[in-house]
């Protein structure tokens, strides 16, 4: 999906009002210095591409983020403010089918959500030069 035509300011507002709080809740009990940010993005469409990938694509050690509240709200925001996004399919089917009934937050998931927080912060500051 090409995120170029999204309403970035509306997505930013949704992040600031709700999604950011859900990310903080997920990370509660974790020190902000515990994980190094290794994923970066260069502009808003690129940031949304990386955010979608980390939020919805299962990774080794963390296959369970898609049903977290921050993930569902991210999906809703993209569906409302990115034309045609609701037509795209997310390839999380197998991981979702295999997920445990009991919620398990692994260290790998915490690291992934920490990366997401960094990507969202970068999304919110598009005029900053990349380090």
């Amino acid at each position: 999906y090409d995120f170029t035509n999204c309403d970035f300011e509306k997505i930013k507002a949704a992040y600031l009002s709700t999604i950011s709080k859900d990310l903080i809740t997920y990370m509660s009990g974790t020190k902000s210095t515990e994980f190094n940010n290794t994923v970066s993005c260069s502009n808003r469409p690129h940031c949304l591409t990386e955010i979608q990938s980390l939020t919805f694509n299962p990774t080794a050690g963390c296959a369970s983020l898609a049903k977290e509240m921050f993930a569902m709200k991210t999906k809703a925001a993209l569906a409302i403010w990115c034309p045609g996004y609701s037509e795209t399919q997310i390839n999380a089917t197998q991981a979702m089918k295999k997920r445990r009934k009991r919620k398990v937050t692994t260290n790998k998931c915490l690291e992934q959500v920490s990366q997401l927080q960094g990507l969202w912060r970068r999304f919110n500051r598009p005029l900053l030069k990349q380090q």
């Epitope: 709700t18 898609a66 399919q89 999380a92 979702m96």
Partner: nanobody
Framework: EVQLVESGGGLVQPGGSLRLSCAAS????????MCWFRQAPGKEREGVSC????????YYADSVKGRFTISADNSKNTAYLQMNSLKPEDTAVYYC???????????WGQGTLVTVSS
């Protein structure tokens, strides 16, 4: 199999109101996102509004903000879209959608037609 069933569509005059309902079967409703989309003839489907059944957060497209109100009744497993000050350009098939329990994709209702015309 989870199902979403919309109702409440119909013909209404410009400036009028309608209330759409979306009844969900199964346990899809709890702590989920429920959204309304619409598709006008010859146009792409567009997102109208979403609500988190977990905390009640809502999102609205600019085209409907201030006129439409989304809500959810968790005890009835039903989401609503109250549509006021309807305009001819609101004419479309309205679809309810929820986040799937078994994949990262949407579960869709069958749609309900809203026609705004005098």
């Amino acid at each position: 199999e989870v199902q979403l069933v919309e109702s409440g569509g119909g013909l209404v005059q410009p400036g009028g109101s309608l209330r759409l309902s979306c009844a969900a079967s199964g346990n899809i409703f709890t702590r989920n996102i429920m959204c309304w989309f619409r598709q006008a003839p010859g146009k792409e489907r567009e997102g109208v509004s979403c609500i988190s059944t977990g905390d009640g957060s809502t999102y609205y497209a600019d085209s409907v903000k201030g006129r439409f109100t989304i809500s959810a009744d968790n005890s009835k497993n039903t989401a609503y879209l109250q549509m006021n000050s309807l305009k001819p350009e609101d004419t479309a098939v309205y679809y309810c959608a929820a986040d799937s329990e078994t994949s990262g994709n949407w579960v869709w209702g069958q749609g309900t037609l809203v026609t705004v015309s005098s």
